[in-house]
């Protein structure tokens, strides 16, 4: 469940957007005679978000340095350029970190953080769920089914609702609730399954309305270099909260001597940084996609935008090969644990497990791996990138493909390595989950590249979607499911079921190639989905009659 | 009708084994947590031993004071509970009772909704 | 492991009268407490589940009530056929146990 909305919603903050502001910017300025006195006055003092076309262009993965010529803009409004364009036009430099806007920018990757901690914390604790509520295999599957279509389905309408109303009280609201929510399931009775299910998709509504508004507050208070690094910051919180969710559920449990504490910890937490959110993060007017102006907004329509987004090949198969992502983080995420477990009962290095919970120390170390593989494979993934983009213009596809089908090998190992090494097994782990998640950054800054700015915030909550519906939505009840089946047709011995289990998650390196496959053909459309995309925006740099999506 | 109906009770010597064995009607065996509770004369109920469905691994639990010594298995296919009693003690000396767990397709519960007629168990030398 | 007590060991009662049957649990245990009747040579059978839920064929006259430590088993005006020993089962961890239980007789 290691998904990407967080780092697709980051991609609103893409260069072609900044350059494509300051553009209208300065020819607004041009048509109203000389100044730019106009330039930034709409946003006021509060301007941080207009950004800058100029100084260094910084992706996830690079950047392109432009000589400065000029002096930065007024100091009162920072990031604001100057009107004149042309070759020697004043370019801004990109606004200082303030302590206030940096303040903002680590609470709500903090609450990034606690998103992603109490999402993991529950599958710290699942065997130990399982256990009270007497849940059977077909309803823990159902207990993180639930959690993800609910979030898959609010995602959308958070992105809807975060373009046009107040975003840091939605957001604070959003945390309010799911802190409330998952306190009050820590004390559900025994007899009620149902709302224990209910509550986590509650959980999933209300930790959508995050996911999906927090990286666009980010994108609003910072210039381009800044804002990339705090962006990176905010994806860095995905790997960080899900490891720490394992970690806090097992060691929760074990101090407490009861599991339901570990469902107590992020509300708490949460608590506090929906407070410091209401408190410290300023009330930011929207970012660039609100300069284009009524008439832009008028002529482009959510089913044209839609359809827009369809034919954009590059798109499509990006989000496709993002499904693939999310449907083997997801399935892998619930069921290694169970399965080294397994797989150290059949070399008898370990008793069967007769009293859950059953790999408790397997989930501790697979949380620490995850932990520190998102963090390389991020830092990995970009590092790729900068290096391939001299020698290709598709390297940002190119690179995530090689991934994918790298980190499908090692997962195919892990399965071979796992009948006679656990160590063995975690390695294959660990150099899988770095590849599989070195693409996170790339992703965002492909969709960046090939998708419009008055076309993101739909292109990123479509992206959340699709890669929910067709990846951890439902990849952790298939493979029970197909675990369940091949054990039916067995004799009951450990030996089965650590093979069926191993049999079922040998889909995941399938899927993983098959994502692979949708990054290359990513590759193939990329240049021209690129150029189309800047050919584009260019068009709405022109006089609005000219103007055409 | 739910029916459970237990066999293989006897007479025993001290370390010897003995197979109690459930059959079965009247509900889907398959889905549905079984257990083992016994009651030696005289006195109250205690909990020996539960297994789940084969879809949650067959999963056994088991009383601290058996643990080691007896094991719960069951065959779908004959909708029978069995509890295989080795290294008997006098004091395992009781009524052993077929229970069956509520089934809530999703989730069972853990106490015990009809119950065997039961069968003696004597371990004395 | 979680203990249960029940009080009192031994309960006398004239037919009609209404009784309180106590149990205490060594934790709090939510409601996560059953009740069970066994008559004389009998097999025990299932009274009231998650301390207050009834059970389809039990007379009304059984209720139950209670969460945390300390639930009651209430039968309103006795009958003779309710003089038998009543058992609670605590479900909220494992091993799952019973208290040693209250037995009704006739005064």
């Known amino acids: 469940m290691m998904c990407l909305e967080c780092a697709s919603a980051a991609a609103g903050g893409a260069e072609e957007e900044e350059a494509d502001a300051e553009r209208r910017r300065r020819r607004r300025g041009a048509q109203r005679g000389a100044g730019g006195s106009g330039c930034c006055g709409a946003r006021g003092a509060g301007g941080a978000g207009v950004s800058a076309a100029g100084d260094e262009v910084q992706t996830l993965s690079g950047s392109v340095r432009r000589a400065p010529t000029g002096p930065p803009g007024t100091p009162g409004t920072p990031g604001c350029a100057a009107t004149a364009k042309g070759p020697g036009a004043q370019q801004p430099k990109p606004a200082s970190l303030g302590r206030g806007r940096g303040a903002a920018a680590a609470i709500l990757s903090l609450g990034n953080v606690l998103n992603y901690l109490d999402r993991y914390t529950v599958a710290g604790v699942l065997l130990d769920i399982q256990q009270h509520f007497g849940v059977k295999a077909r309803g823990a599957g159902l207990l993180q089914s639930v959690f993800i279509c609910s979030f898959m389905v609010a995602a959308p309408i958070f992105g809807y609702l975060g373009d046009r109303f107040n975003r840091k009280v939605i957001l604070s609201c959003g945390i309010f609730f799911w802190s409330a929510v998952t306190f009050s399931s820590s004390f559900i009775p025994q007899q009620y399954f149902w709302l224990l299910v209910l509550s986590r998709g509650l959980v999933g509504i209300g930790e959508a309305s995050y996911s999906t508004i927090a990286p666009t507050i980010i994108g609003d208070l910072f210039t381009k270099n800044t804002r990339t690094l705090m962006l990176s910051v905010f994806y860095f919180a995905i790997p960080l909260g899900s490891g720490l969710g394992y970690i806090t559920g097992s060691s929760v449990k074990q101090a407490a001597g009861d599991w339901h504490w570990a469902l107590r910890v992020s509300p708490v937490l949460g608590m506090i940084t929906g407070t410091l959110i209401l408190i410290l993060v300023p009330a930011t007017k929207r970012g660039h996609a609100d300069q284009l102006g009524d008439q832009l907004k008028a002529r482009t329509s959510w089913l044209r935008d839609m359809k827009a987004l369809i034919r954009n090949r590059s798109y499509v198969f990006s989000s496709l090969a993002t499904s693939a992502v999310s449907f083997a983080t997801g399935a892998l995420g619930m069921w290694i644990p169970l399965y080294l477990h397994r797989a150290q009962v059949v070399q008898k290095t370990a008793e069967t497990c007769n009293s859950p919970p059953c790999g408790a120390k397997d989930s501790l170390i697979f949380g620490a791996i995850t932990c520190f593989t998102g963090f390389l494979g991020v830092v990995t993934g970009a590092g790729a990138t900068r290096w391939c983009r001299l020698k290709t213009q598709r390297a940002d596809p190119l690179v995530c493909a090689v991934g994918m089908l790298g980190s499908a090998i090692f997962i195919c190992l892990i399965f071979v390595a796992a009948k006679s090494s656990i160590v063995g097994a975690y390695i294959c782990i660990f150099v899988g989950e770095t590849l599989l998640f070195s693409n996170w950054a790339i992703t965002a800054d492909i969709l960046m590249y090939v998708v419009i700015p008055t076309r993101r915030a739909t292109a990123v909550a479509l992206q959340s979607f699709t890669s929910h519906l067709l990846g951890d939505a439902g990849s952790p009840y298939l493979i029970g499911f197909i675990s369940d089946l091949i054990r039916q047709s067995t004799k009951d011995s450990p030996l089965w079921e650590f093979l069926s289990l191993g049999y079922a998650l040998m889909l995941c390196p399938f899927v993983v190639v098959l994502g692979g496959m949708f990054f290359l053909a990513t590759a193939l459309f990329f240049v021209s989905d690129r150029a189309r995309a800047e050919q584009q925006v260019n068009q709405l740099a022109m006089p609005p009659a000219s103007v055409k999506v | 009708e739910v029916q459970l109906v237990e066999t293989g009770g006897g007479l025993v010597r001290p370390g010897s084994s003995l197979k109690l064995s459930c059959a079965t009607s009247g509900f889907t065996f398959s889905d549905t947590w079984m257990s083992w509770v016994r009651q030696a004369p005289g006195k109250g109920l205690e909990w020996v031993a539960l297994i789940k469905d084969k879809n949650s691994n067959s999963e056994a639990n088991y009383a601290e004071s058996i643990k080691g010594r007896f094991t719960i298995s069951r065959d779908d296919s004959k909708s029978r509970v069995y509890l295989q009693m080795n290294t008997l003690r006098d004091q395992d000396t009781a009524t052993y009772y077929c229970t069956r767990h509520e089934d809530f397709y999703y989730y069972s519960g853990y106490y015990f909704d009809y119950w065997g007629q039961g069968v003696m168990v004597t371990v004395s030398s | 492991d979680i203990v249960l007590t029940q009080s009192p060991p031994t309960l006398s009662v004239t037919p009609g009268e209404s009784v309180s049957l106590s149990c205490r649990a060594s934790?709090?245990?939510?409601?996560?407490i059953h009740w069970y009747q066994q008559r004389s040579n009998e097999s025990p059978r299932l009274l009231i589940k998650y301390a207050s839920q009834s059970i389809a064929g039990i007379p009304s006259r059984f209720s139950g009530s209670g969460s945390g430590t300390d639930f009651i088993l209430s039968i309103n005006r006795v009958e003779s056929e309710d003089f038998s020993v009543y058992y609670c089962q605590q479900t909220y961890s494992l091993p799952l146990t019973f208290g040693p239980g209250t037995k009704l007789e006739v005064k």
């Open positions: 934790q709090g245990i939510s409601t996560s």
